[in-house]
Interface confidence: low
């Protein structure tokens, strides 16, 4: 399957549901459809409270049954491993594909973990992470943040992806904002004596 690179914030904002969950076993093929489903155990919901309503959780994640049509294949055998799943809601069910943002929770940087819980939501609907995959590329709007990891790092997993979110600076402007404590080391409080 060929997926467009996605910044974690884009994945968060464009998903109906973002949850932490564990995969409980092998997929089950659903007769008469081209889907299969994985049984999952949801541990935390990070986005989708409004869409879900009173539902206590999702027992299954549905995906196309064929890899050639971008079906997700879960490789880990570790049932205790927790995953971040950014998926879509279809007919009340959680749907994922090979292009879904779906990674072990512990693989996310601490900054990303914090952002999925709290920060990314502030940029949704207001700011857009705009991928720059070839030079030259330019900002098309003040609400865009230019994502250059693919060019500078040769990968979608780069500094902007790991440590930054595109957030409103004022009502008309979005900028990259650092997800950590500070970009610079704190200066020594006392000067050395001459």
């Amino acid at each position: 399957c060929s997926c467009a690179p996605t910044h974690p914030q884009t994945a968060f904002c464009n998903s109906d549901l973002v949850i932490r969950a564990k995969f409980m076993g092998s997929p089950e093929i659903i007769e008469t459809t081209l889907y299969q489903r994985y049984e999952i155990k949801m541990t935390k919901m990070l986005k989708g409270f409004d869409a879900v309503g009173n539902a206590t959780g999702f027992r299954f994640a549905y995906t196309p049954a064929m890899e050639s049509l971008c079906g997700y294949v879960h490789k880990s055998q570790n049932r205790s491993e927790e995953f971040l799943i950014a998926g879509r809601l279809r007919n009340g069910n959680l749907h994922i594909t090979a292009c879904s943002f779906l990674v072990p929770w512990h693989n996310l940087s601490p900054a990303q973990q914090k952002a999925f819980v709290k920060t990314y939501s502030a940029g949704c609907g207001v700011c857009t992470v705009f991928p720059c995959s070839a030079i030259p590329c330019k900002l098309e709007s003040d609400s865009h943040c230019l994502w250059t990891d693919q060019i500078l790092m040769g990968s979608e997993k780069g500094y902007q992806s790991d440590h930054f979110a595109c957030l409103p600076r004022n009502p008309d402007l979005c900028t990259w904002q650092y997800l950590g404590v500070s970009m610079t080391r704190s200066l020594p409080l006392a000067k050395a004596e001459a």
Epitope: S2, A4, T10, N14, L34, Y35, C70, R88, T97, C99
Partner: antibody, heavy 121, light 109 residues
């Protein structure tokens, strides 16, 4: 070379049934999806559904689910599109197309010549 | 199904370059590198011109090129020729659904 040959034009009355065909040759018919696409007079292309002749797995567009049936007979390398009860709004050109779908490629690379279906009382 | 958005018509003179846009969502055009472009002359079947955003099938002129930025894909035809006059359709993919654009009529002046 890859060829998809469709059955000839049809003129039908509302309420009648119809089955049109698409015969593939020049490639392994059971190894590729076949899609059906509708084009109403003067309008654009609309994807209706796909079938994998190897095992007859079928997927429909929500717009066409329950309106048509897609099937295939792999022994004669032929895919079918059928209606149980035609409506005037089914008047259109219908194309079959081979879907290359695997790995990093996904496209309808070869098309049939089209079957014109006219439904009129 | 929501069709991808294309301009209804574009035009250009012989030798010029034109670009046709195709706007979708983060789920289809933006989510996968699966955008195809088809050319259709009146009374003929569609013909594949570009696949996987920017790849040309063998036999298609290198005057045709494709690209994508965000949720918008583009087809560019350089050195416009009379035989390029036709309808052009983009097509993308989203979770086992295939969606076409509304089509763009290209007129060579």
């Amino acid at each position: 070379q890859v060829q998809l040959v469709q059955s000839g034009a049809e003129v039908k009355k509302p309420g009648e049934s119809l089955k049109i065909s698409c015969k593939g040759s020049g490639y392994s018919f059971t190894s590729y999806w076949i899609g059906w696409v509708r084009q109403m007079p003067g309008k654009g292309l609309e994807w209706m559904g796909i079938i994998y002749p190897g095992d007859s797995d079928t997927r429909y567009s929500p717009s066409f689910q329950g309106q048509v049936t897609i099937s295939a007979d792999k022994s004669i390398s032929t895919a079918y599109l059928q209606w149980s009860s035609l409506k005037a709004s089914d008047t259109a050109m219908y194309y079959c197309a081979r879907l290359v779908g695997g790995g990093y490629d996904l496209m309808f690379d070869s098309w049939g010549q089209g079957t014109l279906v006219t439904v009129s009382s | 199904d929501i069709a991808l958005t294309q301009p209804a018509s574009v035009s250009g003179s012989p030798g010029q370059s034109i670009t046709i846009s195709c706007t979708g969502t983060s789920s289809d055009v933006g989510g996968y590198n699966y955008v195809s472009w088809y050319q259709q002359h009146p009374g003929k079947a569609p013909k594949l011109m570009i696949y996987d955003v920017s790849n040309r099938p063998s036999g298609v002129s290198n005057r045709f090129s494709g690209s994508k930025s965000g949720n918008t894909a583009s087809l560019t035809i350089s050195g416009l020729q009379a035989e390029d006059e036709a309808d052009y359709y983009c097509q993308s993919y989203d979770d086992m659904q295939f969606v076409f654009g509304g089509g763009t009529k290209l007129t060579v002046l």
